[in-house]
């Protein structure tokens, strides 16, 4: 259905990282423009990125103001210099996205160690606590602040003389490890949302390494 | 030395909303602690009904989770429990708690190491 | 949901002896997340062990926890008159958070 010279779109996709979220989709338009529409299950229709040429819309105001809600959101396509053009049903063309809940879907970004200090034969990692574009009360809140205990981060490390890997967890973001006097040793982080089906881990942090600005040591 | 103290009416009718507060004193509601809500049915054991962040992050247990909501105020220091549509299976003994981080294999673990003294609520007509 | 299944339901002992309390899980519970609770009538439940065999601060020696994966075990090694209350295991790894039915020790 619709009029020849416009096209549905197809291929929705959610980007989402740290819940800034993305819609993307496809063709890249010829002779047509397209707006886009998102509600909740249970909310109504919101118009954003009105009769864009771009294949992608950024709805990541609207998802933040609830990332536990399921999303929906559909893609109109409006023939360029006629918006007010429709279908032979009387209808633009459109497509829906598949649903998307932030909260369960949302990709983990790359996490970043703060810092590293070592006392004796101990070292405590401080892994960033990111900020997302999630607000309460006018304040973007953390990834932490946002996950609570859903959020879990697994450190690796190891000495830098040798390729043998240890692991520790930790409900908070801070690890304290033990480790051999005299060694230096490299770390790298990676958050994990274990009770998730989809998503759950983000990829590694960089390695940081002992020795390095980073790193502050007291005996 | 954080104490904490549940507050809120001892009976509450059938079908109605239970309505519970816990104060926090001797410490910072905002200071990386979550905060629960447990239950003790009369002669039995201990059951988690859910938690919060000072953020407004919770977690609930989902047999009761579509009749709990726990909220805090950071102002006031507190964080609440409503139970709604509650039911004789509902008496108990309400305690409120603090979860705070332990260091344990290398990392940090939330465990209740603060409890409130717990008030007892009974549903009846 | 993690089961937790506590045994003995009761315990009948003489102060100086030593108590064992057993802690079973459904499935395997991350010992970074096993704790061991005393209640006694009246009041609120106190944390005594947490990550199934760290000692909480002021939580005297004789008490001691250990094992791990699904079976989890408290360890009175002399009892004292206080000693004698009922006993919780928890775990808060998985929601919903789930306690033993509890374990009674009793002055025999």
């Known amino acids: 259905s619709g009029t020849t010279n416009t096209v549905a779109a197809y291929n929705l996709t959610w980007k989402s990282t740290n819940f800034k979220t993305i819609l993307e989709w496809e063709p890249k338009p010829v002779n047509q423009v397209y707006t886009v529409q998102i509600s909740t299950k249970s909310g109504d229709w919101k118009s954003k990125c009105f009769y864009t040429t771009d294949t992608e819309c950024d709805l990541t105001d609207e998802i933040v103001k609830d990332v536990k809600q399921t999303y929906l959101a559909r893609v109109f396509s409006y023939p360029a210099g006629n918006v007010e053009s429709t279908g032979s049903a009387g209808e633009p063309l459109y497509e829906n996205s598949p649903e998307f809940t932030p909260y369960l879907e949302t990709n983990l970004g790359q996490p970043t160690i703060q810092s590293f200090e070592q006392v004796g034969t101990k070292v405590n990692v401080t892994v960033e606590d990111e900020r997302t574009l999630v607000r309460k009360n006018g304040t973007f809140l953390s990834l932490r602040d946002v996950f609570g205990k859903d959020l879990i981060y697994t450190l690796y490390y190891w000495k830098s003389s040798s390729s043998g890997k240890k692991t520790a967890k930790t409900n908070t973001n801070e690890f304290l490890i033990d480790v051999d006097k005299g060694e230096n040793y490299c770390f790298s982080v990676q958050a994990v949302i274990p009770s998730r089906t989809v998503n759950r881990k983000s990829t590694d942090s960089p390695v940081e390494c002992m020795g390095q600005e980073k790193g502050e040591f007291r005996e | 030395q954080v104490q904490l103290q549940e507050s809120g009416p001892g009976l509450v009718k059938p079908s109605q909303t239970l309505s519970l507060t816990c104060t926090v004193s001797?410490?910072?509601?905002?200071?990386?602690?979550?905060w629960s809500w447990i239950r003790q049915h009369p002669g039995k054991g201990l059951e988690w009904i859910g938690e919060?962040?000072?953020?407004?992050?919770?977690r609930y247990n989902p047999s009761l989770k579509s009749r709990v909501t726990i909220s805090v105020d950071t102002s006031k220091n507190q964080f609440s429990l409503k139970l709604s549509s509650v039911t004789a299976a509902d008496t108990a003994v309400y305690y409120c708690a603090r979860d705070a981080p332990y260091y344990y294999g290398g990392g940090y673990y939330y465990y209740m190491d603060v409890w409130g003294k717990g008030t007892t609520v009974t549903v009846s007509s | 949901e993690i089961v937790l299944t506590q045994s003995p339901g009761t315990l009948s002992l003489s102060p100086g002896e030593r108590a064992t309390l057993s802690c079973r899980a459904s499935e395997s519970v991350d010992s970074s997340y096993l704790a061991w609770y005393q209640q006694k009538p009246g009041q609120a439940p106190r944390l005594l062990i947490y990550g199934a065999s760290t000692r909480q601060t002021g939580i005297p020696d004789r008490f001691s926890g250990s094992g791990s994966g699904t079976d989890f075990t408290l360890t009175i090694s002399r009892l004292e008159p206080e000693d004698f209350a009922v006993y919780y295991c928890?775990?808060?790894?998985?929601?919903?958070?789930?306690f033993g039915g509890g374990t009674k020790v009793e002055i025999k």
């Open positions: 919060i962040y000072y953020s407004g992050s919770t």
């Open positions: 928890q775990q808060a790894g998985v929601v919903p958070y789930t």
């Open positions: 001797g410490g910072s509601i905002s200071s990386g602690q979550y």
